[in-house]
């Protein structure tokens, strides 16, 4: 089943997020992803946990998953590089770099997103955009078109409270509010964008969605700049 969903959001403006990727398994949407270089998509390591025998591909330039669109193209994956410290039972280091079989054809609907390299927390209250093709309600309805939602960043101390994530939020993670509007499992690997810059990647740990006491958890890309650079080099 797809890992993730946008709850309480709305349909995104078509192709206004040209960095947005759909990581697909055997032709079906599995996770979100973000184009960070011409031949590289960043996603979440847990997305490929159950994909050992399947064919992993990356869809770029899409708004609708099913309808033909001139900018849409499906790329094979040459190499999948999960973060070496990612583990199935933790949310830490939940990053994955996917090398496309060839450089993406860039255009208005396909464009890499600048990512944050300065290792400094986003200020609490900052509104950030998260997008994905995950299910849109608790009944499990899957959207065909890209959805998005604006979420305020939550301070780490609040996120670390016992009734929230009880100390699990390290300096390499960040949180966003989850009061009815939220990202969740299937949006995993998708981008959290603040001020036009990629700040976080949706983690793919199991988590109740849309409950304000269980904020969304995002991997801070700035904290992994050295690793990303080393893989892309």
């Amino acid at each position: 089943p797809p890992r993730g969903r946008i709850l309480g959001g709305r349909e995104a403006e078509a192709h206004a997020r040209p960095y947005m990727a759909s990581v697909q398994l055997n032709g079906a949407h599995l996770c979100g992803g973000v184009l960070v270089a011409e031949q590289w998509v960043l996603s979440a390591a847990h997305c490929l946990e159950d994909a050992a025998d399947g064919k992993v591909q990356v869809l770029l330039g899409a708004h609708s998953l099913s309808q033909p669109e001139p900018s849409k193209r499906l790329y094979d994956v040459l190499r999948a590089v999960p973060h070496p410290d990612s583990q199935p039972d933790t949310i830490d280091h939940d990053l994955l770099l996917l090398q496309l079989s060839e450089k993406a054809t860039l255009g208005p609907a396909v464009r890499p997103l600048p990512w944050q390299r300065v290792d400094r927390d986003v200020a609490p209250g900052t509104l950030c955009d998260v997008a994905g093709w995950g299910i849109v309600n608790h009944a499990g309805r899957r959207p065909d078109s890209l959805q998005h939602v604006l979420l305020p960043v939550l301070d780490r101390a609040t996120c670390n409270r016992r009734t929230h994530h009880d100390g699990a939020i390290t300096e390499r993670l960040m949180c966003a509010e989850s009061n009815r509007r939220d990202s969740c499992k299937g949006d995993s690997g998708g981008p959290l964008v603040c001020g036009g810059v990629l700040e976080g990647v949706v983690t793919s740990g199991s988590r109740v969605c849309g409950n304000r006491k269980k904020p969304g958890i995002y991997t801070r890309v700035a904290s992994y700049a050295a690793w990303i650079d080393s893989v892309l080099a």
């Epitope: 609490p124 301070d155 780490r156 101390a157 609040t158 670390n160 409270r161 016992r162 009734t163 994530h165 009880d166 100390g167 699990a168 939020i169 300096e171 109740v208 409950n211 006491k213 269980k214």
Partner: antibody, heavy 116, light 112 residues
Framework: EVQLQQSGPELVKPGASVKISCKAS????????KNWMRQRHGESLEWIGD????????SYNQKFRGKATLTVDKSSSTAFMELRSLTSEDSAVYYC?????????WGQGTLVTVSA | DVLMTQTPLSLPVSLGDQASISCRSN???????????LEWYLQKPGQSPNLLIY???NRFSGVPDRFSGSGSGTDFTLRISRVEAEDLGVYYC?????????FGGGTKLEIK
């Protein structure tokens, strides 16, 4: 290693105030709430209140409103609790504890004795 | 406030014995998020409390597996399968689901 170092014992007169401190080390101070507890001699623990070190937001046990005031100094990674209008009933050991995970990390306690 | 009642007040045991401590709340301590924030702490003489169990049954890192927690709703139990000398002290249950958080009155585990 996470450590919470509390200030030393205090002997204070009835009606006076006292400010005790809890200096954090081994982690980023602003990443976790600080909670305060009271333990009278031979008794159980009582939760006084908590503070978010990012913005100073506080929550108090109704029982301690007007008695305790919680503050932080981010520059020195220190949390403070001021107790005012002290009486013999306030004689106790006061603990700070980091919240997350649970109350896994506690200060060593500060003994406050109120005596004429 | 949620009242946490522990029994017994004192528990004399022989080393190697099993020990059980009960903790009852006067209302459910299931949080609105669905979790139950029931914890157990051990306070040895002259020391600060130490976290043993969180969310009813989860052992904190480094806590020996002879400690186990169980229960739901309003009725909770801490079990020590084989008491060792280092386990002696006062055990407190704690609920963090409702404000203000509250501790039980304590159970003193001592040598028979």
């Amino acid at each position: 290693e996470v450590q919470l170092q509390q200030s030393g014992p205090e002997l204070v007169k009835p009606g006076a105030s006292v400010k005790i401190s809890c200096k954090a080390s081994g982690y980023t101070f602003t990443d976790y709430y600080k909670n305060w507890m009271r333990q009278r001699h031979g008794e159980s623990l009582e939760w006084i209140g908590d503070i978010n070190p990012n913005n100073g937001d506080t929550s108090y046990n109704q029982k301690f409103r007007g008695k305790a005031t919680l503050t932080v100094d981010k520059s020195s990674s220190t949390a403070f609790m001021e107790l005012r209008s002290l009486t013999s009933e306030d004689s106790a050991v006061y603990y700070c504890a980091r919240e997350g995970p649970s109350f896994a990390y506690w200060g060593q306690g500060t003994l406050v004795t109120v005596s004429a | 406030d949620v009242l946490m009642t522990q029994t017994p007040l004192s528990l004399p045991v022989s080393l190697g014995d099993q020990a059980s401590i009960s903790c009852r709340s006067n209302q459910t301590i299931v949080h609105s998020n669905g979790d139950t924030y029931l914890e157990w702490y051990l306070q040895k003489p002259g020391q600060s409390p130490n976290l043993l169990i969180y969310k009813v049954s989860n052992r904190f890192s480094g806590v020996p597996d002879r400690f186990s927690g169980s229960g739901s709703g309003t009725d909770f139990t801490l079990r020590i399968s084989r008491v060792e000398a280092e386990d002696l002290g006062v055990y407190y249950c704690f609920q963090g689901s409702h404000v203000p958080p509250t501790f039980g009155g304590g159970t003193k585990l001592e040598i028979k």
